[in-house]
């Protein structure tokens, strides 16, 4: 049986043009599903907002490495995938669509609490 058949699929259609302050980030997700137009990083801020970022950008690669390192320091055994558990909020310049598909993304978490930017999200049934 395929695992987690009804897990949500998060897709990014454009990327933030701004470099987000690292201090505002809590976690990230890798988006790799072929049902999405492009591979992407979705940063999750401490305010639980989600921001699509270009995984080819050097700052994005540096940030996700830092988040990986921090995550291993703070909770070495907790790597979890929960695109569903993360709330999207406040519209920004980045579109984010949710569809239903198994294991579309992986979430990597670290710390908690503060301020930030978000994305527009649409639920597709």
């Amino acid at each position: 049986q395929p695992d987690a058949v009804n897990a949500p699929l998060t897709c990014c259609y454009s990327f933030t043009s701004k470099m987000i302050p690292m201090s505002r980030l809590e976690s990230y997700k890798r988006i790799t599903s072929s049902r999405c137009p492009k591979e992407a990083v979705v940063f999750v801020t401490k305010l639980k907002r989600e921001v699509c970022a270009d995984p080819k950008k050097e700052w994005v690669q540096t940030y996700i490495k830092n988040l990986d390192r921090n995550q291993m320091r703070s909770e070495p055994t907790t790597l979890f995938k929960t695109a569903s558990a993360l709330r999207s909020s406040a519209p920004l310049n980045v579109k984010l669509t949710r569809k239903s598909e198994a294991n579309a993304s992986t979430t990597f978490s670290t710390t908690t609490s503060s301020t930030s930017v978000g994305v527009t999200s649409v639920t597709v049934n």
Partner: antibody, heavy 117, light 107 residues
Framework: QVQLVQSGAEVKKPGSSVKVSCKAS????????MHWVRQAPGQGLEWIGR????????KFDPKFQGRATITADTSTSTAYMELSSLRSEDTAVYYC??????????WGQGTTVTVSS | DIQMTQSPSSLSASVGDRVTITCKAT??????LAWYQQKPGKAPKLLIS???SLETGVPSRFSGSGSGTDYTLTISSLQPEDFATYYC?????????FGGGTKVEIK
């Protein structure tokens, strides 16, 4: 659906070069990295290098630096890997694969390259 | 370069068995580990990325665990279609490197 289709098998002489192609459909190759991985008969997998088709930037395993060339033609959504100064140890199946994060979720079917005198 | 050591190199098991394959990196790879399944004459198939995240369509009998330098692939109840060779791969830093593979054979 993402599909990577590679060119056919090649038989080459030692010292010569081979160029293998990988045509992508179902994705814009400018949005990903295209990697090349090889597998000698009965052996494990070995990463050769990758290209960012959007700008032509490449990265190689030092073992292949200078002998492997990876290029991409975004107009035809095709990536190429050329290996020069071939020796018998280069006999292998060569795979292209996509992946911006360094792991490979879609693979070509493989191209067998035989180096023999 | 980060070296990946996979063990065992081969194992014999029966349908229904629980199978565990381990992979050890020469340095911390911060969960940036992928597992692949390869059948003879075919390209590898991605099973797991990020040490634990199962790819779409991969049966839930496959699971990944581990952290730091030590990682494990577990098949909870081996099925006939699972007889294959399995590879781990680190994607923490280039050059990306693979383990030597584990061939899972029928007992």
């Amino acid at each position: 659906q993402v599909q990577l289709v590679q060119s056919g098998a090649e038989v080459k002489k030692p010292g010569s070069s081979v160029k293998v192609s990988c045509k992508a459909s179902g994705l814009n190759i400018k949005d990903t990295y295209m990697h090349w991985v090889r597998q000698a008969p009965g052996q494990g997998l070995e990463w050769i290098g990758r290209i960012d088709p959007a700008n032509g930037n490449t990265k190689f395993d030092p073992k292949f630096q200078g002998r492997a060339t990876i290029t991409a033609d975004t107009s035809t959504s095709t990536a190429y890997m050329e290996l020069s100064s071939l020796r018998s140890e280069d006999t292998a199946v060569y795979y292209c694969a996509r992946g911006v994060f360094g792991f490979f979720d879609y693979w070509g079917q493989g191209t067998t390259v035989t180096v023999s005198s | 370069d980060i070296q990946m050591t996979q063990s065992p190199s081969s194992l014999s098991a029966s349908v229904g068995d629980r199978v565990t394959i381990t992979c050890k990196a020469t340095e911390d790879i911060y969960n940036r580990l992928a597992w692949y399944q390869q059948k003879p004459g075919k390209a590898p198939k991605l099973l797991i990325s990020g040490a634990t995240s199962l790819e779409t369509g991969v049966p839930s009998r496959f699971s990944g665990s581990g952290s730091g330098t030590d990682y494990t692939l577990t098949i909870s109840s081996l099925q006939p279609e699972d007889f294959a060779t399995y590879y781990c791969q680190q994607f923490w830093s280039a050059p990306y490197t693979f383990g030597g593979g584990t061939k899972v054979e029928i007992k």
